[in-house]
Amino acid sequence: GSTVPPMVNVTRSEASEGNITVTCRASGFYPWNITLSWRQDGVSLSHDTQQWGDVLPDGNGTYQTWVATRICQGEEQRFTCYMEHSGNHSTHPVPSGNSHHHHHHHH
C-alpha cells in the first residue's frame, strides 16, 4: 500500500504530586515502522525512562502506537516528542494545560 503519514497527539496527565505523565500518540499511519521518542532539551531520553505501547492495527489498514514518560511539573517546555516515519520527521511540544491537545498530520 501507499504511505499514510501519522497523526501525532501529545497529552498530559497528573501522575503524582509534582509530576506529570506526558504521552505522545501516533495513529493512522502506514507502514507500521515508526520512530516515536521523547527528548529533553533536544537530547534523547534513555529507553529505561520511557514506556512504549506496541504498534497495533487500528482496524482501518493503518497502525497506532504511543510513548510516555514522567516529568516534573513546570518543566514541560523542555520536552518534545520526536517522530520519524517513511522519510519524514517532526517534533511535538507538550501542551501547556490538560485541555489542550495538539494534532498534527504530517505529509
Partner: antibody, heavy 120, light 107 residues
Framework: QVQLKESGPGLVAPSQSLSITCTVS????????VNWVRQPPGKGLEWLGM???????DYNSALKSRLSISKDNSKSQIFLKMNSLQTDDTARYYC??????????????WGAGTTVTVSS | DIQMTQTTSSLSASLGDRVTISCSAS??????LNWYQQKPDGTVKLLIY???SLPSGVPSRFSGSGSGTDYSLTISNLEPEDIATYYC?????????FGGGTKVEIK
C-alpha cells in the same frame, strides 16, 4: 539495497582533527538515524554518537567535547569530526543505520569501516 | 555507563556443536539487548535484537534469551561460517555499550 560506506584519511597526526564521511544509499537520511561506532585494534566496540533524521544529535558523554556529527541529506552523507586526536583514538570507525521502533533499537546495517591511525 | 561483561573471551567448539555465549550487565537492562556478529574481516552484522528477536535473513540456529542482568546467545548447530566474534550491546541507558566480545573458533 541499504548500504553505508565510510571514507577517512587513514593517518592523522597527534593533536590534529579527524574527519570521516559516511555515504549511504538505499534509504533517506531524513527518516533514519545514523550511528558512529569505533573499535581500537584488538578491542571491543564503542558507540560515539548518532544523528537523527531531523539533524538532532546524541553523543557519548565521554567524548562529547571532542565530537561533532553532521550531515548533508541531499548528498546522502554523514560527517564525523573529532578534535585533539591521541594515539588511543587509533581505531576502525564504522557508521551504522539505527532502527528505533518502540522498545527496539538496534543497528541493522553497518558499513565496512575505515581504519584511522593516529601517529606522527 | 552500564558495563557489559562477556566473561568468555574465546572458545573452541566442533562443527555441529551447540554453543552458548553469555553476557551480563552491571544493572538490569529490561531486555534492551542486541547481539552482533563480527567476521574476521571486520564485517559487522546484526544477529539478535531485543533479547530474542531474529532479523530476517539470520539463520534460525541462532537464538537469544535472558532477563534482568543475564543474557545469552545460542548457536544450536555450529557451522563453518559462524567463525566470528560475538558482541552483546545494551540500549537501556545512553550511551549504548557493548560487551568485550567472545571469539568462536573451530576445534
Amino acid at each position: 539495497q541499504v548500504q553505508l560506506k565510510e571514507s577517512g584519511p587513514g593517518l592523522v597526526a597527534p593533536s590534529q582533527s579527524l574527519s570521516i564521511t559516511c555515504t549511504v544509499s538505499g534509504f533517506a537520511l531524513t527518516g533514519s538515524g545514523v550511528n558512529w561506532v569505533r573499535q581500537p585494534p584488538g578491542k571491543g566496540l564503542e558507540w560515539l554518537g548518532m544523528i537523527w533524521g531531523d539533524g538532532n544529535t546524541d553523543y557519548n558523554s565521554a567524548l562529547k567535547s571532542r565530537l561533532s556529527i553532521s550531515k548533508d541529506n541531499s548528498k546522502s552523507q554523514i560527517f564525523l569530526k573529532m578534535n585533539s586526536l591521541q594515539t588511543d583514538d587509533t581505531a576502525r570507525y564504522y557508521c551504522a543505520r539505527g532502527a528505533h521502533y518502540g522498545k527496539r533499537w538496534y543497528f541493522d546495517v553497518w558499513g565496512a569501516g575505515t581504519t584511522v591511525t593516529v601517529s606522527s | 555507563d552500564i558495563q557489559m561483561t562477556q566473561t568468555t573471551s574465546s572458545l573452541s567448539a566442533s562443527l555441529g556443536d551447540r554453543v552458548t555465549i553469555s553476557c551480563s550487565a552491571s544493572q538490569g537492562i529490561n531486555n534492551y539487548l542486541n547481539w552482533y556478529q563480527q567476521k574476521p574481516d571486520g564485517t559487522v552484522k546484526l544477529l539478535i535484537y531485543y533479547t530474542s528477536s531474529l532479523p530476517s535473513g539470520v539463520p534460525s540456529r541462532f537464538s537469544g534469551s535472558g532477563s534482568g542482568t543475564d543474557y545469552s546467545l545460542t548457536i544450536s548447530n555450529l557451522e563453518p561460517e559462524d567463525i566470528a566474534t560475538y558482541y552483546c550491546q545494551q540500549y537501556s541507558k545512553l550511551p549504548p555499550t557493548f560487551g568485550g566480545g567472545t571469539k568462536v573458533e573451530i576445534k
